[in-house]
């Protein structure tokens, strides 16, 4: 069971230093910008952080959500990364789900981030590049210190 | 709703080069992050990728066909081209434009295709 | 190059029955990108299943794909007169794109 608890504004970026956005189709990318492109590409850059109760404690328990027109909120169903049209709910009467990622802290570094699937157990979100797209994917854990399941999440409050 | 529509000639002579253009409408080609493709299809056959294209310029080729294959686009036009150089009969195909959906890598929008025969 | 085998090459089944079609690859595939099509004579190729298992816009909830790795799984639950047709398994790995040869899905 999570129960949504306050929810803050975000910048997300990889190790790279390069910004989370989605494009016009709603998919997250990263691309290199400037401070200045990051406030210009806003709101495709600002990313609702919901906070969730859990009832197994787990990590703390997030989804990540944006909102241009309307809001959408990611999900890793299937494994494949998307935003889906949606609120983050205010309940979820369920242990896992598509839109829940706990979001810890990489020890040792305590600015950076790693968001853990709540469906897939030890899948991570991941920026991957991919011919010339630097894509945000759901990536199996399969080294210790892997860089690209750590990210810095910036508050914009 | 996206469109693809295949254009060029249906007959080339053995040596000679083949060039067919992919002409989208209902979006734009430079608003895409995803790629722009060329499949074919020999009668009777199985479905061969030639190779892709970003708007930005970037090309992605089969590598048994990568020395013969070139991929342009024109983002004015929304149209993008390809060219095979010194065909044989064995080129003789239907010839597919595509979008490739670059979240999962599949072909999700494919022109209705248009049969180039090789011959002299 | 990862090579992609269909089996059978081709499937004999009546309506209302279920098909089972295979694809394997040579190498494992990353991140599930398999994809399945749909291809009836003198038409393009219509896209079924992207990511192995994510059903495409439109597309009835009778088919279904399953897998990863190296082994993946169209499944129709129950064949309709329209679904007789030639279907293709395809890949995304290293910026390639690659097809596997097809399985013909006919009318026993």
């Known amino acids: 069971y999570f129960g949504k608890l306050e929810s803050k504004l975000s910048v997300i970026r990889n190790l790279n230093d390069q910004v989370l956005f989605i494009d016009q189709g709603n998919r997250p990318l990263f691309e290199d910008m400037t401070d200045s492109d990051c406030r210009d590409n806003a709101p495709r850059t600002i990313f609702i952080i919901s906070m969730y109760k859990d009832s197994q404690p787990r990590g703390m328990a997030v989804t990540i959500s944006v909102k241009c027109e309307k809001i959408s909120t990611l999900s890793c169903e299937n494994k494949i990364i998307s935003f889906k049209e949606m609120n983050p709910p205010d309940n979820i009467k369920d242990t896992k789900s598509d839109i829940i990622f706990f979001q810890r802290s990489v020890p040792g570094h305590d600015n950076k981030m790693q968001f853990e699937s709540s469906s897939y157990e030890g899948y991570f979100l991941a920026c991957e590049k991919e011919r010339d797209l630097f894509k945000l994917i759901l990536k199996k854990e399969d080294e210790l210190g892997d860089r690209s399941i750590m990210f810095t999440v910036q508050n914009e409050d | 709703q996206l469109q693809l529509q295949e254009s060029g000639p249906g007959l080339v002579k053995p040596s000679e080069t083949l060039s067919l253009t992919c002409t989208v409408s209902g979006g734009s080609i430079s608003r895409s992050y995803d790629y722009w493709g060329w499949i074919r299809q020999p009668p009777g056959k199985g479905l061969e990728w030639i190779g892709s294209?970003?708007?930005?310029?970037?090309?992605y080729y089969n590598p048994s066909l990568k020395s013969r294959v070139t991929i342009s686009v024109d983002t004015s036009k929304n149209q993008f081209s390809l060219k095979l150089s010194s065909v044989t009969a064995a080129d003789t195909a239907v010839y597919y434009c595509?979008?490739?959906?670059?979240?999962?890598?599949?072909?999700?929008?494919w022109g209705q295709g248009t049969l180039v025969t090789v011959s002299s | 190059e990862n090579v992609l085998t269909q089996s059978p090459g081709t499937l004999s089944l009546s309506p209302g029955e279920r098909a089972t079609l295979s694809c394997r690859a040579s190498q494992s595939i990353r991140n599930n990108y398999l994809a399945w099509y749909q291809q009836k004579p003198g038409q393009a190729p219509r896209l079924l299943i992207h990511g192995a298992s994510s059903r495409a816009t439109g597309i009835p909830d009778r088919f279904g794909g399953s897998g990863s790795g190296t082994d993946f799984t169209l499944t129709i639950s129950r064949l309709e007169p329209e679904d007789f047709a030639v279907y293709f398994c395809q890949q995304y790995g290293n910026s390639i794109i690659t097809f596997g040869p097809g399985t013909k899905v006919d009318v026993n």
């Open positions: 294209i970003y708007y930005r310029g970037s090309t």
């Open positions: 595509a979008r490739e959906y670059s979240t999962t890598w599949s072909i999700d929008y």
